[in-house]
């Protein structure tokens, strides 16, 4: 009996035309939502003038339906038993699941001013930038609608730059009508233990963002894992959102709509400093902001974002060192609300429920050549927004799963 089940599972989780896994893999049957909370700055003038702590108030959720588009350019390669694809991006606003509209205004850091001053540290260049910032009446902070902040707006300061630069700015610009990849993953035909594991991303086995093993593309994309998952396993996966591979460890048994699943969570150790977890040494890429690699809980992904000083963390700086959040008031980290987890059905390795939580921050530094940053006395890692991307297997799918998988086992 067990052998037959194993044989059936091995057959059905292969990523090729005709299998249960393939059908669900091409276009997920699960509705996936991305909720955003924006950090609205309450005291912009005091920060700019007096280098005060930034007082933020989160506003949200603003909810979008995402990952509803089928994978594109799906190409099987029988030679190495891989399948390659693009994952198209799309987001549809869901007013009924949101606290307001896409036209709601927020006071946030001026993304272009913060980024330009970081990308061009040369004092002579900064004098020129300063004149353009002043001429465009730009400041350290700005008021933007949700739509502008997320999906892009034409920046008045960048519009004055006399050489060709992209004048459009947005936390996720460009997004709609773009795609993530190309991913090339093992289809599991030769070895089921490799199914869905990424072979290459954008044609490479490495990211070119990090040193040493930190640069590796490990595991799957977290939508599924090779079958017969054990509680003792460390599940590796790659997330293009955070420009790195990361891992999850078993936390607890959960019953999801009558299906026994394993809850795997991202442990605090994954966000630790090299002092606490030497394995993380290659994720520390500079010495000043990281206080000689002793800070933890934030990841500098500027190399992955064309030099823009983007830092990824967990929401509300959960699992981050006190020095990171000491310049920000109004944060309330909470493990239950702000950690990331995956609920995995262990026989198939399918992720039946997940909550991916992350926060996007931008570094802003004092500059004695740029007047709007001149009075700052310290560096700030400024939270812009945090997101909660969730998906749960639908009732019909769960019923099918219970009858065809878990029911047969029991």
């Amino acid at each position: 009996g067990d052998m037959l089940i194993q044989k059936t599972i091995k057959k059905e989780v292969v990523l090729e035309e005709g299998t249960i896994a393939f059908k669900n893999w091409v276009k997920t049957g699960t509705e996936i939502y991305r909720q955003f909370w924006i950090f609205d700055v309450q005291n912009p003038q005091e920060v700019m003038m007096n280098s005060s702590n930034i007082q933020v108030k989160q506003r949200g959720p603003y909810t979008y339906r995402v990952r509803f588009l089928a994978k594109e350019n799906i190409t099987q390669d029988p030679k190495d038993n891989t399948v390659s694809f693009l994952q198209p991006n799309g987001a549809i606003f869901e007013p009924s699941l949101s606290v307001g509209t896409e036209a709601d205004n927020f006071t946030v850091l001026n993304l272009a001013v913060a980024a330009a001053s970081h990308i061009y540290p040369n004092p002579f260049v900064q004098v020129v930038l300063n004149s353009l910032i002043n001429k465009s009446k730009s400041s350290m902070f700005q008021v933007r609608t949700l739509r502008e902040l997320l999906w892009g707006y034409t920046d008045p300061f960048l519009s004055l730059v006399p050489y060709p630069v992209s004048t459009r700015v947005g936390m996720f610009y460009p997004y709609n009508n773009t795609a993530d990849g190309v991913y090339k993953v093992f289809n599991g035909k030769d070895s089921i233990s490799k199914v869905a594991i990424i072979d290459t991303y954008k044609g490479k086995r490495n990211l070119s963002y990090w040193e040493s093993y930190c640069d590796m593309i490990n595991g799957t994309d977290a939508a599924s894992f090779p079958p017969f998952v054990e509680k003792s396993q460390v599940l590796q996966f790659f997330s293009s959102d955070i420009c790195r591979s990361i891992y999850a460890v078993f936390e607890s048994d959960v019953n999801l709509k009558g299906i026994p699943v394993y809850r795997f969570v991202l442990p605090s150790k994954a966000f630790a400093s090299p002092v606490q977890n030497p394995d993380n040494h290659c994720f520390c890429t500079e010495k000043i902001i990281s206080k000689n690699c002793t800070s933890y809980g934030v990841l500098d992904i500027s190399k992955c974002k064309e030099g823009k000083p983007v830092y990824i963390s967990l929401p509300h700086f959960l699992y981050a060192s006190p020095d990171v959040s000491e310049t920000i008031d109004g944060l309330n980290p909470n493990e239950e609300e702000h950690r990331t987890y995956l609920d995995i059905e262990p026989i198939t390795g399918f992720t039946l429920q997940f909550a991916k939580r992350l926060q996007v921050n931008l570094l802003v530094k004092p500059s004695n050549k740029i007047q709007v940053l001149k009075r700052l006395k310290r560096n700030y890692i400024v939270p812009i927004l945090w997101l909660n991307e969730t998906g749960t297997i639908g009732d019909e799918k769960a019923k099918m799963f219970r009858s065809q998988v878990t029911g047969k086992i029991n």
């Epitope: 003038m49 910032i133 009446k137 902070f141 008021v143």
Partner: antibody, heavy 123, light 112 residues
Framework: QVQLQQSGPELVKPGASVKISCKAS????????MNWVKQRPGQGLEWIGR????????NYNGKFKGKATLTADTSSSTAYMQLSSLTSVDSAVYFC????????????????WGQGTSVTVSS | DVVMTQTPLSLPVSLGDQASISCRSS???????????LHWYLQKPGQSPKLLIY???NRFSGVPDRFSGSGSGTDFTLKISRVEAEDLGVYFC?????????FGGGTKLEIK
């Protein structure tokens, strides 16, 4: 102290052009916008446009495009406005007014104005 | 273009009285840089306009503290707590958030 000294009154014929000047002193001329404003006798104020002397960049009120041309000479710290194809409706007092934005610390709108130049269009 | 509507057109007052002038804009004057560029000017006969209040509520240098400005978004008010003879003239509100900049029609402050 900041001063804007405008050229004297002008009496011009219909169809002709006139160029009025505004000499600035007491601040960095090249890094502040210079605005021009029209006021017809007994009427309100109308914004014509502005020029950034540092690079000659201009913004115009659509109503005055083709009527007014703004220029600036940084070497003499002087802004100019040329009005063309003059008619009686162009008879007015024209003001220059500087607009400073200095990193959010000095940010007053149009804080200093010239004394005005009267333009009379008459045959 | 942003339309600035000023009321009243004429405001007769007695010296020592309080005066209040209203200015309404056809759209929000909150600039993307977090400032609200609504200003008040006083123009006396034969003179150029003089800046009184900048960015809604800030008195320009040398302006007496009997002048105060308030408001946000689209509704703004200028108040003179005790009118003096030197305050007589035409008051204009103006916005410099959106190009083209625009002015209110003016309010004439005169003796009752």
């Amino acid at each position: 102290q900041v001063q804007l000294q405008q050229s004297g009154p002008e009496l011009v014929k219909p169809g002709a052009s006139v160029k009025i000047s505004c000499k600035a002193s007491g601040y960095t001329f090249s890094t502040s916008w210079m605005n021009w404003v029209k006021q017809r006798p007994g009427q309100g104020l109308e914004w014509i446009g502005r020029i950034y002397p540092g690079d000659g960049d201009t913004n115009y009120n659509g109503k005055f495009k083709g009527k007014a041309t703004l220029t600036a000479d940084t070497s003499s710290s002087t802004a100019y406005m040329q009005l063309s194809s003059l008619t009686s409706v162009d008879s007015a007092v024209y003001f220059c007014a500087r607009e400073v934005y200095y990193g959010g610390y000095e940010d007053y709108g149009m804080d200093y104005w010239g004394q005005g130049t009267s333009v009379t269009v008459s045959s | 273009d942003v339309v600035m509507t000023q009321t009243p057109l004429s405001l007769p007052v007695s010296l020592g009285d309080q005066a209040s002038i209203s200015c309404r804009s056809s759209q929000s004057l909150l600039h993307t840089n977090v400032n609200t560029y609504l200003h008040w000017y006083l123009q006396k006969p034969g003179q150029s306009p003089k800046l009184l209040i900048y960015k809604v509520s800030n008195r320009f240098s040398g302006v007496p503290d009997r002048f105060s400005g308030s408001g946000s978004g689209t509704d703004f008010t200028l108040k003179i707590s005790r009118v003096e003879a030197e305050d007589l003239g035409v008051y204009f509100c103006s916005q410099s958030t959106h190009v083209p900049y625009t002015f209110g029609g003016g309010t004439k402050l005169e003796i009752k």
